[in-house]
């Protein structure tokens, strides 16, 4: 999960393999500020996971959380 | 090293249940994805579920909903897979997989199980 | 839900390219990890990713993907590569991992 530096959240390791899309609610971008780039899922349990955006199904589960 | 080790060979009467056991050594079971794949004899490769440790829950393949529980015991580090309601098609190899080394595909592999369903 | 298509065989002469293709609707937007099987074994892990190789696994191992296919080359082919090749991918639409029927590979000779 995200760590907050400066009240920014940022990453600092990726979950690589996929989680259910089910169970995802929403997501965010960390800051720009942040040494690594992500994508944070938030469960629907609210736990936050850090995602690698350059993933494939990071990618595709970021286009169907746009569309819905 | 990781290692994923399995419980014996089991034979059951149709309408039994049976409970397969995996115990993992060379990392904690909470850390990582645990999965359990069976194939029939000359069959391929049948996913049945898995754990998802960043949500706390498990997710079964639609086919066994209902019939297969999978539960973790973390004070000993074994994974359990119990199949109910079986019958003669249930007759498998079935395996436990993990992916601690790359993480999103099944690196890791237990030696597999034989259930046997006869009456 | 997803389906994946493998043929059921491949046959090739030893020092050859066999080639194992993995067939899926608009695969390209997915990771496709190949496993490979031997008779009694358990499946290992042979190529993840789409291209890329475990630690252990020899160079003569690759994986592409483009379009609606999948490949996995295995290129100087030994007879110690005779087994099952199995593709797989996770279906988000489900939220099941998918694997494909299976491809047995033989070597001439």
């Known amino acids: 999960s995200p760590h907050a530096s400066d009240t920014t959240p940022c990453c600092f390791a990726y979950i690589a393999r996929p989680l259910p899309r089910a169970h995802i609610k929403e997501y965010f971008y960390t800051s720009g500020k942040c040494s690594n780039p992500a994508v944070v899922f938030v469960t629907r349990k609210n736990r936050q996971v850090c995602a690698n955006p350059e993933k494939k199904w990071v990618r595709e589960y970021i286009n169907s959380l746009e569309m819905s | 090293q990781v290692q994923l080790v399995q419980s014996g060979a089991e034979v059951k009467k149709p309408g039994a249940s049976v409970k397969v056991s995996c115990k993992v050594s060379?990392?904690?079971?909470?850390?990582?994805?645990m999965h359990w794949v069976r194939q029939a004899p000359g069959k391929g490769l049948e996913w049945m579920g898995g754990?998802?440790?960043?949500?706390?829950?498990?997710i079964y393949a639609q086919k066994f909903q209902g019939r297969v529980t999978m539960t973790e015991d973390t004070s000993t580090d074994t994974a359990y897979m119990e199949l109910s309601s079986l019958r003669s098609e249930d007759t498998a190899v079935y395996y436990c997989?993990?992916?601690?080394?790359?993480?999103?595909?099944?690196?890791?592999w237990g030696q597999g199980t034989t259930v046997t369903v006869s009456s | 839900s997803y389906v994946l298509t493998q043929p059921p065989s491949v046959s090739v002469a030893p020092g050859q390219t066999a080639r194992i293709t993995c067939g899926g609707n608009?695969?390209?937007?997915?990771?496709v990890h190949w496993y490979q099987q031997k008779p009694g074994q358990a499946p290992v892990l042979v190529v993840y990713?789409?291209?890329d190789r475990p630690s252990g696994i020899p160079e003569r191992f690759s994986g592409s993907n483009s379009g609606n296919t999948a490949t996995l080359t295995i290129s100087r082919v030994e007879a110690g590569d005779e087994a099952d090749y199995y593709c797989?991918?996770?279906?988000?639409?489900?939220?099941?991992?998918?694997f494909g029927g299976g491809t047995k590979l033989t070597v001439l000779g």
């Open positions: 997989a993990t992916d601690p080394l790359y993480e999103g595909s099944f690196s890791v």
């Open positions: 060379g990392y904690t079971l909470t850390e990582f994805a």
């Open positions: 754990f998802v440790p960043e949500d706390g829950e498990t």
């Open positions: 797989q991918v996770w279906d988000s639409n489900t939220d099941h991992w998918v």
């Open positions: 608009n695969i390209e937007s997915k990771s």
């Open positions: 990713d789409d291209s």
